[in-house]
């Protein structure tokens, strides 16, 4: 089997206030089987911004189709940004457990930054 | 609650096609995989088609691939399977199902009795 | 491709713990459930994802995989447990469903 990577390739993602951000995340396998989650932050506080197995993300969409079978793009748009919203996001890669999944991989993280206001 | 109605069965001659629907109500459709399974007289489940929420992507076991096609319509919350090129072996009763997240299945219809005789 | 393999039939007494067994697939690239189905109704999923039970479930049934076997667990059992129950599997590195043959499960 070919071994899975987390690829993240922007490091610094700078964003507009209200404006809606991209981050991007792809696989290279689909195995293990498990899902995908977003982070904010690393360690026991990190914040969970996407779970694509459950869960409600009002601001939160992904950049392509999780219900196709063969999908490795894991990206996803965080809508109307505010200063809170800055930090390093990981996407993290969970292989199936019981009784719960267990982490298998995570990206690089890609850190939000506010950018310049547009003049 | 999630109710999947199937319509379209019925007594078909060998060498025939059939359109089945399936309408899907009280989710939101377009966010959900779907996908078709039959069971014939007394025997077990099997696994004939799936399709992406968008519906650009379909899958298929070699048993029906180029035989049956599995589409959907999002504006009318509808799952459709055409089969083609009928047989006896294909009387069964057909149930759409939706998938989970890991297309696994979590809710079926009633499903619809195809008989192939003639 | 993969086959399940179940057991054709399980019996147990009213108040015991039945489990059935479905073999094969591949724990790295595989999830699970099972489906219940009493005579002429549709099937009802009773355990998806190897050991996750819907809401609307009784607590009484639970899954479990070990290696390439997946078990499902009826505890005090009821006679309206009687039914067919099939395991499914859904196969990442094919893109493949499949189905076991059914255990017909029997309340004495």
């Known amino acids: 089997e070919e071994e899975l990577q987390m690829i993240q390739p922007e490091k610094l993602l700078l964003v507009t206030v209200g404006k809606t951000a991209t981050l991007h995340c792809t696989v290279t396998s689909l195995l293990p089987v498990g899902p995908v989650l977003w982070f904010r932050g690393v360690g026991p506080g990190r914040e969970l911004i996407y779970n694509q197995k459950e869960g409600h993300f009002p601001r939160v969409t992904t950049v392509s189709d999780l219900t196709k079978r063969n999908n490795m793009d894991f990206s996803i748009r965080i809508s109307s940004i505010t200063p809170a919203d800055v930090g390093t996001y990981y996407c993290v890669k969970f292989r199936k457990g019981s009784p719960e999944n267990v982490e298998f991989k995570s990206g690089p993280g890609t850190e939000m930054a506010l950018g310049a206001k547009p003049s | 609650d999630v109710q999947l109605v199937e319509s379209g069965g019925g007594v078909v001659r060998p060498g025939e096609s059939l359109r089945l629907s399936c309408a899907a109500s009280g989710f939101t459709f377009s966010s959900n995989a779907m996908s078709w399974v039959r069971q014939a007289p007394g025997k077990g489940l099997e696994w004939l088609a799936g399709i992406s929420a968008g519906g650009s992507d379909t899958y298929y076991p070699a048993s029906v691939k180029g035989r049956f096609t599995i589409s959907r319509d999002n504006s009318k919350n509808t799952l459709y399977l055409q089969m083609n090129t009928l047989t006896a072996e294909d009387t069964a009763v057909y149930y759409c199902a939706r998938e989970t997240w890991n297309h696994l299945f979590d809710y079926w219809g009633l499903g619809t009795l195809v008989t192939v005789s003639s | 491709s993969y086959e399940l393999t179940q057991p054709p039939s399980v019996s147990v007494s009213p108040g015991q713990t039945a489990r059935i067994t479905c073999s094969g697939g591949d724990y790295y690239s595989t999830y699970y459930a099972w489906y219940q189905q009493k005579p002429g109704q549709a099937p009802v999923t009773v355990i998806h994802?190897?050991?996750k039970r819907p809401s609307d479930i009784p607590e009484r049934f639970s899954g479990s995989s070990s290696g390439t076997t997946v078990t499902l667990t009826i505890s005090g059992v009821q006679a309206e447990d009687e039914a067919d129950y099939y395991c499914g599997g859904y196969d990442g590195r094919t893109y493949i469903n499949t189905f076991g043959g059914g255990t017909k499960l029997t309340v004495l």
């Open positions: 994802s190897d050991d």
